[in-house]
């Protein structure tokens, strides 16, 4: 028998520095977690103790903090090289700055293979990107070889900016021939490493003949065997065992997100490459693991540029940006409108001639807007200003909801109106009218939404049974501020870009902004 240790991360999302337990900015260092310096210590400790170790990443290193905003992927290549990753799969967020924003900082600089079998380049891009990412890679490990085959969510064109010259094929259809190829090369130990979410990971384990282990990402799935060490609730045991269609037991793993855990899976293979046993657990990277001094010094060195960036002007406002709780928790506020407009703008994807865009709606809890921005400071808006407005380090995500769920959400928005509570919704691509004289749960008297399947966008009444795409904070997607109906009834959830980054990009693009209060949210009394 031959034993392999697989160390894995996924959805790190630019958390190069240690973070608080909830993966936001580290405040009390003695209670902070993760970060590449701490990750390096644990990885090296395991490499010290075990002879056959692979360190893999299942995508979405890009996007999530000011590190990505400033360094644009150069930081990912540099620190992943320093940690000596053995392979990485492309995630959807690796395309956030377009194909060029992937090629130059990451693909050309990485000293490890970057993989995806279901992304096919065409046109002029095909020769430009040739060899920079691969469908699979055979890695020598000790006296053996291990095949790693990559995959990426086929929803990427709706979630990011891969352009028109990359085709995202069905994962299973694309993976099978590559695995077959590895088998003909006498590679009998094969890991599928990819970024399509836990449901697809399980399908790959079930359907793709010859895959021995699946290491996934995208859905931020936390798996654990035994008592979990922090706040995350396991979605199943680690590893999650899937019985394949040809009767094999295939371990599937994922390691939550944000570099909080290091996935640790030990696999025992027989001489024919069959999995005899698999066991392990994610390792919580808490403060009991010291940050490596060499990597930490490097982080501190790279950090300097971030501090300078925070105070530079992104753009100007010629109006007061009212982010006060007195406004945003009671009525339409222009800061809410600005943020929602930025959220929609960030999700413009012309992927179908029938649709002007795939999504037109935004909702945003007023309690998530934490500060106004005064225009009387020469109109200057900085990252620092935006960090005061959006201090929680969240993301603006894409969900699919039924109209009936949206209606419930808007009823919840005003169910206890007047108490300055955070659930009051700011909107974009939505016109809502409330009648507060009616009883809670029956106060939404008009709810019109902007069409997407139209050449001239206009507002139509919400249909209860129709499925709509909506951009919203991850806080709401996870049921925050009492929006349990969103969490319970959402049909799809894809994590998006860092909230501050979305707004800062929009302001930089617009140069001068002047958001108004324009009647998106109205109040009425009497008959309708």
């Amino acid at each position: 028998a031959w034993e392999l240790t697989i160390l894995h991360t996924n959805d790190v999302h630019s958390r190069l520095e240690q973070t608080s337990e909830d993966s936001s900015k580290c405040v009390n260092a003695s209670r902070c977690m993760g970060g590449v310096a701490r990750l390096f210590t644990k990885v090296q400790q395991i490499r010290r103790a075990e002879p056959n170790v692979l360190l893999l990443d299942a995508g979405d290193q890009y996007q999530g903090t000011i590190w990505f905003t400033v360094y644009k992927g150069a930081e990912v290549a540099h620190f992943m090289n320093a940690l000596r990753y053995d392979a990485m799969a492309l995630g959807n967020h690796e395309f956030d700055n377009g194909v060029e924003g992937l090629i130059e900082p990451l693909l050309k600089e990485a000293k490890f293979p970057i993989l995806s079998a279901n992304i096919k380049a065409k046109g002029p891009l095909a020769s430009q990107i040739s060899g920079l990412y691969l469908p699979y890679k055979v890695l020598p490990v000790g006296d053996e070889v291990v095949g790693i085959v990559g995959y990426t969510s086929k929803e990427t064109p709706f979630l990011s900016n891969p352009g028109t010259n990359l085709v995202f094929e069905d994962e299973i259809t694309a993976l099978q021939p590559e695995v077959d190829k590895l088998k003909t090369l006498n590679v009998n130990k094969i890991i599928a490493l990819g970024h399509s979410g836990f449901e697809m990971d399980k399908l790959i384990a079930q359907k793709v003949r010859g895959v021995d282990v699946v290491v996934g990402g995208h859905s931020n799935t936390f798996l654990y065997t035994g008592n979990p060490p922090s706040k995350e609730v396991p979605a199943g045991k680690y590893p999650f065992i899937v019985t394949s269609d040809d009767g094999r037991k295939v371990p599937v793993v994922q390691a939550y997100a944000f570099g909080k855990y290091l996935g640790y899976l030990k696999i025992e293979f027989d001489e024919r490459g069959n999995v005899i046993s698999s066991h392990g657990n994610p390792i919580l990277l808490n403060s009991s693991i010291p940050e490596d001094p060499s990597i930490k010094a490097d982080i501190n060195k790279w950090r300097i540029k971030l501090d300078n960036y925070s105070t530079q002007e992104l753009g100007k406002t010629i109006v007061y940006l009212d982010g006060s709780s007195q406004s945003c928790r009671f009525r339409e506020c222009n800061m809410g409108n600005l943020i929602c407009d930025a959220m929609i703008n960030n999700n413009l994807r012309h992927t179908d001639e029938m649709f002007w865009n795939h999504v037109s709606m935004c909702i945003l809890n007023g309690g998530g807007i934490r500060s106004p921005i005064d225009e009387r400071n020469n109109g200057t808006i900085t990252w620092e200003n935006l960090a005061a407005v959006l201090p929680f380090g969240g993301t603006f995500d894409l969900v699919q909801l039924k109209g009936s769920t949206l209606k419930k959400a808007f009823e919840h928005s005003v169910h206890r109106y007047g108490q300055s509570t955070g659930e009051f919704l700011q909107v974009g691509g939505i016109h809502v009218v409330y009648d507060l004289s009616r009883k809670p749960g029956d106060r939404v008297v008009k709810l019109d939404v902007l069409c997407t399947k139209c050449r001239v966008p206009s507002y139509d009444p919400l249909k209860m049974d129709e499925v709509y795409k909506v951009i919203l904070p991850n806080f709401l997607a996870n049921g925050g501020d009492g929006f349990q109906m969103i969490k319970d009834e959402l049909l799809r959830h894809d994590s998006g870009d860092q909230d501050i980054n979305v707004v800062s990009t929009y302001i930089s693009k617009m140069k001068v902004i002047y958001p108004a209060v324009e009647g998106r949210i109205k109040f009425s009394t009497g008959s309708h």
């Epitope: 010290r48 103790a49 075990e50």
Partner: antibody, heavy 121, light 111 residues
């Protein structure tokens, strides 16, 4: 368990050559930088040379540059130090030490038992 | 090169008492907020063993009675309470820049 075993020491004439080896086991050798450190009889420690995990980065002490060559074979889990143009002041116990770092040096965390090189006519 | 000066050259301490060894660097060994100072213990006929790295972090399996402190150019190694097994040579070493340099050593014995 981490094990580093040096070999190849012995008596060499001034101007002569010697190749030291360090066999590593019990860990993923290819993930760690490696050093040679020497200690002259009844003296302190002197760092000699460093090689990164993938052999991309190599450093030498001024006292040995041009005479000693550090190399490694990751497939055989072995570190080498080729000694040439030996002088009497090169007489020492030669330790191989692993670095906790990978591509850039960090700190020596494990040491072998050492092999003795005596340069004398 | 950074010159490391250790003091005292030798030290005798009673069992259960505190032993303090100092090390001064000819220039700062700090780099971006990290002090690249390490301490080693060496017993006769044995290779050195890592005690402390980055000024204050304990090496793997090192007893809690060994602690390190300092920054910039001035560092110290503390052993408390002193045990019989602690009789050895102690070396400081900087890993801020090439060439890595060691102090001349401090011989610690029981009084």
């Amino acid at each position: 368990d981490v094990k580093l075993v040096e070999s190849g020491g012995g008596l060499v004439q001034p101007g002569g050559s010697r190749k030291l080896s360090c066999a590593a086991s019990g860990f993923t050798f290819s993930s760690f930088g490696m050093h040679w450190v020497r200690q002259a009889p009844e003296k302190g420690l002197e760092w000699v040379a460093y090689i990164s995990s993938g052999s991309r980065t190599i450093y030498y002490a001024d006292t040995v540059r041009g005479r000693f060559t550090i190399s490694r074979d990751n497939s055989k889990n072995t570190l080498f130090l080729q000694l040439t143009s030996l002088r009497s002041e090169d007489t020492a116990i030669y330790y191989c030490a692993s670095d906790f770092g990978s591509s850039s040096p960090n700190y020596f965390d494990y040491w072998g038992q050492g092999t003795t090189v005596t340069v004398s006519s | 090169d950074i010159v490391m000066t250790q003091s005292p050259a030798s030290l005798a301490v009673s069992l259960g008492q505190r032993a303090t060894i100092s090390c001064r660097a000819s220039e700062s060994v700090d780099n971006y907020g990290i002090s690249f100072m390490n301490w080693f213990q060496q017993k006769p006929g044995q290779p050195p063993k890592l005690l402390i790295y980055a000024a204050s972090n304990q090496g793997s399996g090192v007893p809690a009675r060994f602690s390190g402190s300092g920054s910039g150019t001035d560092f110290s190694l503390n052993i408390h309470p002193m045990e019989e097994d602690d009789t050895a040579m102690y070396f400081c070493q900087q890993s801020k820049e090439v060439p890595w340099t060691f102090g001349g050593g401090t011989r610690l014995e029981i009084k």
